[in-house]
């Protein structure tokens, strides 16, 4: 027969043959030949290939540093990569979380919209009329004004953003 | 002539082992990878572990794997199922297969055993 | 993984009529694809692979033909030991090694 020119999806073209490629979790160690299959190895601790391959080396499992906020979100098997993510107040700065950084707090006169994950830091909105923030926190929401109607008060001193209205007592009418 | 015999088959109970074997000849054993293909009662061909001709490399459907061990002996013509933690979904009549080719990246199946029952039931 | 479909699920013919079966992939397999006659109670045999070649000791009747995605198994005239069930495998991306859920051929 002619020698191929094209292999199947999980072969490689060498020396006018098709060999079979190595599965994932294991690296080429030779060639196939004429009388033999291709040879391959399981990756060692700590590595994997998560694809079928003829890689020589498999790749080293991504490590997790505690010197820059990573932890393991999930261990590496010879076939995935190891999941970093990041000690609790903190969170990835990129897709790859190679490093992580301090959940942003929001200042006063804004509350919480949406609490950071490990992956997402936390969105801030600025309170709106009827709310306010007298703290800077990573996980308190704007706080509605205090209703003095509702406690037989007046408004002594009006809200802001920043801090609560202040009721008193009403006014008593001299006789 | 080429003959596939499977053996071992049986009745065991959930949790239970069970060892297949299938006796070759007719051809150069080494020289092909098998396959074990199962068929549950009624249901269609359903294909379980391939090993290579001469090295010996194995894969497993998502099925079986880490329970199920293929192994041959080229001294003796012999291809072996090594079935773990059987449940009653493995219920089904075992076949071996010879493949066309000596890799695992797998082509058709010329030959097939007549096959052999495992029963998984309490 | 690739998923083999097969139709008819099952099909009623008559001695004589021409028969055909059609398997899809669900992305292209080019031409290595086979086809399996399976009796009750009896081990599957080859009669076609890569798509259109005929194993040896497989009557002429029998034929195959497609590439890519969609594949034909076509009786050109039905005998009474045609009446089985056919399967497609396909062998391109490999393992694991998938076949279609058969097709059952039935005298009408």
């Known amino acids: 027969p002619e020698p191929p020119t094209a292999c199947r999806e999980k072969q490689y073209l060498i020396n006018s043959q098709c060999c079979s490629l190595c599965q994932p979790g294991q690296k080429l160690v030779s060639d196939c030949t004429e009388f033999t299959e291709t040879e391959c190895l399981p990756c060692g601790e700590s590595e994997f290939l998560d694809t079928w391959n003829r890689e020589t080396h498999c790749h080293q499992h991504k490590y997790c540093d505690p010197n820059l906020g990573l932890r393991v979100q999930q261990k590496g098997t010879s076939e995935t990569d190891t999941i970093c993510t990041c000690e609790e107040g903190w969170h990835c700065t990129s897709e790859a979380c190679e490093s992580c950084v301090l959940h942003r707090s929001c200042s006063p006169g804004f509350g919480v919209k949406q609490i950071a994950t490990g992956v997402s830091d936390t969105i801030c909105e600025p309170c709106p009329v009827g709310f306010f923030s007298n703290v800077s926190s990573a996980f308190e929401k704007c706080h509605p004004w205090t209703s003095c109607e509702t406690k037989d008060l007046v408004v002594q001193q009006a809200g802001t953003n920043k801090t609560d209205v202040v009721c008193g007592p009403q006014d008593r009418l001299r006789a | 002539e080429v003959q596939l015999v499977e053996s071992g088959g049986g009745l065991v109970q959930p949790g239970g082992s069970l060892r297949l074997s299938c006796a070759a000849s007719?051809?150069?054993?080494?020289?092909?990878?098998m396959n074990w293909v199962r068929q549950a009662p009624g249901k269609g061909l359903e294909w379980v572990s391939i090993?290579?001709?001469?090295?010996?490399?194995?894969y497993y459907a998502d099925s079986v794997k880490g329970r199920f061990t293929i192994s041959r002996d080229n001294s003796k013509n012999t291809l072996y199922l090594q079935m773990n933690s059987l449940r009653g979904e493995d219920t089904a009549v075992y076949y071996c297969?010879?493949?066309?080719?000596?890799?695992?990246?797998?082509?058709?199946?010329?030959?097939w055993g007549q096959g052999t029952l495992v029963t998984v039931s309490s | 993984d690739i998923q083999m479909t097969q139709s008819p699920s099952s099909l009623s013919a008559s001695v004589g009529d021409r028969v055909t079966i059609t398997c899809r992939a669900s992305q292209s397999i080019s031409s290595y694809l086979n086809w399996y006659q399976q009796k009750p109670g009896k081990a599957p045999k080859l009669l076609i692979y890569?798509?259109?070649s005929l194993q040896s000791g497989v009557p002429s009747r029998f034929s195959g033909s497609g590439s890519g995605t969609d594949f034909t198994l076509t009786i050109s005239s039905l005998q009474p030991e045609d009446f089985a069930t056919y399967y497609c495998q396909q062998s391109y991306s490999t393992p694991p090694i998938t076949f279609g859920q058969g097709t059952r051929l039935e005298i009408k």
């Open positions: 007719g051809f150069t054993f080494s020289s092909y990878a």
């Open positions: 890569a798509a259109s």
């Open positions: 090993i290579s001709g001469t090295i010996g490399k194995t």
């Open positions: 297969a010879k493949d066309t080719e000596r890799d695992i990246t797998g082509s058709p199946f010329d030959y």
